[in-house]
Structure formats: structure tokens, C-alpha cells
């Protein structure tokens, strides 16, 4: 009975050639889509001249098919029972699932101006930057197409920088023809309770972005977890998109295409300030923007983004402190639309449905030496876009799952 099923499950979730888990792990059988909503700035001049609140209007979804490429360089290591791989990146625009085309225009923060003025705070260098910004006719805001904003464009200001820097800028540049990793994960052969748990990422057990425990690479990549998941568990996973490990807790039982799954969600506590959640002290990396680590709901990942002042949050600043969203008008956070969840089949530990939601923001600060930032009276964490990456097990796969896994148990 149960022992036989357990034995079968343990055998089938091992990450090695011939198992059900391995086949779906190498190349996901689920169609994964990434939807983008861009925050179109409605009052660029007023912000630049008067330091007004930024009025944004979200436009989307613009949908791309992602994660359709098989893992590469899959290599088993029999000695330490691990398997290493690269996860290739690819995105294909899906016009039928989008409100417009990749050529649609948006008024957004000038990424290069905001980043350069933050990175180079030396007064003399800022004077150089100011002359280059003026010469290139750049401003605090810019109009860019969706394709440019996401995948890259040649920036006119950066093209004038007096030494060879990358002049191409884009929120996800470079993306196509790149890969995430190398990941090295436990294959579960010697210990099934470690299956899919990351041993190293890019050859290291920590990230070098954070202090203390915040820097650890914990858990899996969230595509699956070790089998026999309990509702009481805290599921740890690492997300390279947000340059950190995070966790999910059980919320409710869900029936997904006839398969009983556990819905795990990212709790608001994971985004809390160290005042409320002392464990988060090491995610507070500076004192000014974070108001002495009392602000919450935004994560400064600049160390992971070559010094560029990128802040990650939940969409519409869900679970963020009022001071973060106060200078931005037009945001409407709600849990149903904007939180992240994972629907996990508890016996196998497979994630059969998920919605990963996050928002990309950029910090822009006043600068007395840079004309286009001179009139700002405050710092802004400016929302650029939010994304919803979703995947759901297909009907055929669900039937197979019901007959081979849950059906046998029930």
C-alpha cells in the first residue's frame, strides 16, 4: 500500500535519466507566460520642474512565452549526487495575448540618467555627466518602445561617456541567448529529502550581495520541492530575478484540474522591515532611502545590478510602507492580483501552477549638478513595470498525473 507508493514516488522524483521528474525538469511541459504591465508616466514635465507626485497609468498586459528552452549542459556528478545545468533564457512575444505591439511607446524614467547620477556621485564627475546629458538631449524621462525598454536600446547619453562603457540599456538586457546559472542541485539519489535543493549557484553557496544569513542560497528554484510536502512547512527557494532566497507558507487547499494541491504564498512578513521582522535586518543595506530601515516592501538590489539603483517590490507596492508609494499616484495594490503563489502537489513536491509577480523600480535622486534632476526636492522609487509570470499544468499532463499519482493514492 502506502509504502509501495512512497517507494515509487521516491524513485520517480529523483533527477536522473528515466524518471518522470527528470523528463519534466529538463524541459518544462508547462507553457509559461510572462505578462508585463508598463507604468506610463503622465506628467513628466511637472515632476521634473516641480518635483510633483509622479502620475502613472499601467498599460498591459504585453505577453511573452518564456522558459520554453530545455536546460543545457546537464551534468550528473555521481560522487556528490548532484546535477548541474544552465537555464537558458528566451522570450517570444505573443500578440494574441497582448493589448498592443512591441512598438508601443511609453514615457518612462530615463534609466541611464537615473543610474549614472546614482553611481557617480562625485561632484566633478556629475558636472561631466551633466554636460553629456545636455549634449545628448537626454532628460529625466524618455519615450521608449516596449521592445527597447525590455530588451535594450542604444542610449544617446551613454554613447558620449568618455571611456568605453556598454551603451546598450534595457531592463532585461541582455536576455535572449543568455543563460542563468550554473546551478548545481541535489539529484536525490542518496537522500530524497534533498532533491532539487540548490547546492551551489555560479559555483558558490552564497551570493556575496548581502550580509549574514540573507546571503545564503536556500532551497530549490521553486519549480519543485522535495516530496511529501507538509502544510506546516516553510518552503524556501532562491530566485535569481530578485537576487535572494525567499520563502512561502501554506495558505489553502486548492483543486487544480482534479488534483489536490497546496497553495503556498509569499507572506507579507517576508517583505517587512527589520523593526517588524528582525530576520530581515540584513536586507536593509543603507539608511537614508530606507529611513533607518523602517521602510518596507522594497528591496535594494543595486549590488546585484552593477550599482544601478534597482529596487524590487511586489506590483503596485503591495505590502510596502506608505512612504514608498506616497510620491506615486495611480497605484492600486490588491493581494489577489499582485501576490506570488505556488500550487504544489504535496506527494511529489511538483509545482503544478504558479504566479510569480514582481515590480521593477528605479531610484532617482535630486542632484544639484545635473540640470534635469536639479529641481527634485525628494527621492523617488519610480515604478517602471510589473510582471506576472504564470504556468499551469496542461490538461493532458493533468490527466496523466491524476491517473499515475493522485488516482493511485486515493
Amino acid at each position: 500500500g502506502d509504502l509501495l507508493i512512497q517507494k515509487t514516488i521516491k524513485k520517480q522524483v529523483v533527477l536522473e535519466e528515466g524518471t518522470i521528474a527528470f523528463k519534466n525538469w529538463v524541459k518544462t511541459g508547462t507553457e509559461v507566460y510572462r505578462q508585463f504591465w508598463i507604468f506610463d508616466v503622465q506628467n513628466p514635465q511637472e515632476v521634473m520642474m516641480n518635483s510633483s507626485n509622479i502620475q502613472v497609468k499601467q498599460r498591459g498586459p504585453y505577453t511573452y512565452r518564456v522558459r520554453f528552452l530545455a536546460k543545457e549542459n546537464v551534468t550528473q556528478d555521481a560522487e556528490d549526487n548532484t546535477v548541474s545545468f544552465l537555464q537558458p533564457n528566451g522570450a517570444i512575444f505573443e500578440p494574441s495575448l497582448s493589448v498592443g505591439t512591441e512598438a508601443d511607446n511609453f514615457t518612462v524614467l530615463n534609466l541611464a540618467v537615473a543610474a549614472a547620477s546614482h553611481i557617480y556621485q562625485n561632484q566633478f564627475v556629475q558636472m561631466i555627466l551633466n554636460s553629456l546629458i545636455n549634449k545628448s538631449k537626454s532628460s529625466m524621462f524618455q519615450v521608449r518602445t516596449l521592445r527597447e525598454l525590455l530588451w535594450g536600446y542604444r542610449d544617446p547619453f551613454l554613447s558620449l561617456v568618455p571611456y568605453p562603457v556598454t551603451t546598450t540599456v534595457g531592463l532585461f538586457y541582455p536576455y535572449n541567448n543568455t543563460a542563468d546559472g550554473v546551478y548545481k542541485v541535489f539529484n536525490g539519489k542518496d537522500n530524497i529529502s534533498k532533491v532539487a535543493i540548490i547546492d551551489t549557484y555560479k559555483g558558490k553557496r552564497n551570493l556575496s550581495y548581502w550580509e549574514s544569513h540573507c546571503d545564503m542560497i536556500n532551497g530549490t528554484d521553486a519549480a519543485s520541492f522535495p516530496p511529501f510536502v507538509e502544510k506546516s512547512q516553510v518552503l524556501q527557494f532562491f530566485s535569481s530575478d530578485i537576487c535572494r532566497s525567499i520563502y512561502a507558507v501554506f495558505e489553502s487547499d486548492v483543486n487544480l484540474k482534479g488534483i489536490p494541491v497546496y497553495r503556498f504564498v509569499l507572506p507579507s512578513k517576508a517583505f517587512a522591515s527589520p523593526v517588524e521582522n528582525p530576520d530581515n535586518y540584513c536586507f536593509c543595506t543603507e539608511k537614508i532611502i530606507s529611513k533607518n530601515c523602517t521602510s518596507y516592501g522594497v528591496l535594494d538590489i543595486s549590488k546585484c545590478k552593477e550599482g544601478r539603483p534597482v529596487y524590487i517590490s511586489l506590483p503596485h507596492f503591495l505590502y510596502a510602507s506608505p512612504d514608498v508609494s506616497e510620491p506615486i499616484d495611480g497605484l492600486n495594490p490588491n493581494e489577489e492580483e499582485h501576490r506570488t503563489y505556488l500550487d504544489i502537489e504535496p506527494i511529489t513536491g511538483f509545482t503544478l501552477q504558479f504566479a510569480k509577480r514582481l515590480q521593477v523600480n528605479l531610484l532617482v535622486k535630486p542632484s544639484e549638478k545635473i540640470q534635469v534632476l536639479k529641481n527634485l526636492k525628494r527621492n523617488y522609487i519610480v515604478p517602471i513595470l510589473w510582471l506576472n509570470e504564470t504556468g499551469t499544468i496542461g490538461d493532458e499532463k493533468a490527466n496523466m498525473f491524476r491517473s499515475q499519482v493522485t488516482g493511485k493514492i486515493n
Epitope: N122, I128, L132, V161, P162, Y163, P164
Partner: antibody, heavy 115, light 108 residues
């Protein structure tokens, strides 16, 4: 105000080794590519080596004349850049400056290679 | 290696005179990556003009720079005594980074 202070120069015999250090202040050191440039009456200003940022995996470039003998490194936590020089030759003699090039230069430290 | 040749090696001018010094590159480079430094006797070099024509902070407006491709120049419209120094051109277009041999400006 930005400041760069080189140290470690002195007299060394041909074939010997020396390590130069440079401490920076007044700017966010970790955001700048750092260079060593030397100057001698015979050769004028001569670029020696460059080290980029952590985000560039601390990529380095060297002048052909020092490749394999000199190593540039940096410690962002100490706002410092170093130049380890091995198998020194008489033609390595000169004033060594550390600089992010577009900012100011240090006052330099003098290296003399002579027997 | 992109060799930068400066001429003249030494020049002499009276206060109020206009002077021009040149820097020739052995191969074409982007004007964005051609810079000039001023070095006074006993001092370290200072960035003077960046990206061919942009004056660094604190540089008097009598200085100007121009050029493209392989030919670049630094001009002082009306020389003053404090301009006595050696001026070096430098390229950041490719490795190795190279400096010119310098033009020494003497004031009569």
C-alpha cells in the same frame, strides 16, 4: 574632495619584487575602473594596468611590457588598489600614479630599479 | 597599439598669442575617447579636456579642443602665463591605453 595616495615605492634591484598600494577617499571607489600609469623622463606617461569593477568580475588589462610580471588587484572594502611587480627591470623605473583617469591623480610614488 | 604623436614637442608663445598643438593617432578613433591632460612641473597630470572638446571643471574658456578620426588639436585663444605646462593627449578607445609624448608650452 577626492584624494588618492600611493605608497610602496623605493629602491629595488633588477629581478626583485615590489608591491605598490593606493588608498582612495572622497568618491565611491567601488564604482570606478582604476589604473596605474607611470612616468619617466625617457618614456613620458605610460599606461601600465587597469582593473574594472566587481560587476565586471574585476577584469584586468595590462600593457604588453608588463604582462606576466605585474598584477593589478583591488579591495573595495578598503578603497584600495594594488600593483604587485615581479622580475623588475631598469626600464620599470619611474613615478607610479594610481588614477581613475577622469578624476584627479595621486601625487605618485617613485620606483627605482637599479643595482 | 594606437600610437599618439604630438607636435610640436616644445613650443614658445607670448601672453595674448593664440597657440594650437596637435595630436595624431596611428589609427582612427572615436572622438568620445580622446582626452587631454595638463601637467605642471613637479605636479601630477590633471584632466583638462575630455571627449575631444569638453572642458574639465575649472578649465578656462580660452581653451578649446577639436578633431576627429586621426587628427586632434588643443587650442588656447589667448595664452596666459599660468598656461605654461606640458599637455598630453590620451586615447581610451582600445587597449593598450596610450598617451602622446607631450607638448611643452613655454611662455616668453
Amino acid at each position: 574632495e577626492e584624494k588618492l595616495e600611493e605608497s610602496g615605492g623605493g629602491l629595488v634591484q633588477p629581478g626583485g619584487s615590489m608591491k605598490l598600494s593606493c588608498v582612495a577617499s572622497g568618491f565611491t571607489f567601488s564604482n570606478y575602473w582604476m589604473n596605474w600609469v607611470r612616468q619617466s623622463p625617457e618614456k613620458g606617461l605610460e599606461w601600465v594596468a587597469e582593473i574594472r569593477l566587481k560587476s565586471n568580475n574585476y577584469a584586468t588589462h595590462y600593457a604588453e611590457s608588463v604582462k606576466g610580471r605585474f598584477t593589478i588587484s583591488r579591495d573595495d572594502s578598503k578603497s584600495s588598489v594594488y600593483l604587485q611587480m615581479n622580475n623588475l627591470r631598469a626600464e620599470d623605473t619611474g613615478i607610479y600614479y594610481c588614477t581613475p583617469l577622469l578624476l584627479r591623480w595621486g601625487q605618485g610614488t617613485t620606483l627605482t630599479v637599479s643595482s | 597599439e594606437n600610437v599618439l604623436t604630438q607636435s610640436p614637442a616644445i613650443m614658445s608663445a607670448s601672453p595674448g598669442e593664440k597657440v594650437t598643438m596637435t595630436c595624431r593617432a596611428s589609427s582612427s578613433l572615436s572622438s568620445t575617447y580622446l582626452h587631454w591632460y595638463q601637467q605642471k612641473s613637479g605636479a601630477s597630470p590633471k584632466l583638462w579636456i575630455y571627449s575631444t572638446s569638453n572642458l574639465a571643471s575649472g578649465v578656462p574658456a580660452r581653451f578649446s579642443g577639436s578633431g576627429s578620426g586621426t587628427s586632434y588639436s588643443l587650442t588656447i585663444s589667448s595664452v596666459e602665463a599660468e598656461d605654461a605646462a606640458t599637455y598630453y593627449c590620451q586615447q581610451y578607445s582600445g587597449y593598450p591605453l596610450t598617451f602622446g609624448s607631450g607638448t611643452k608650452l613655454e611662455i616668453k
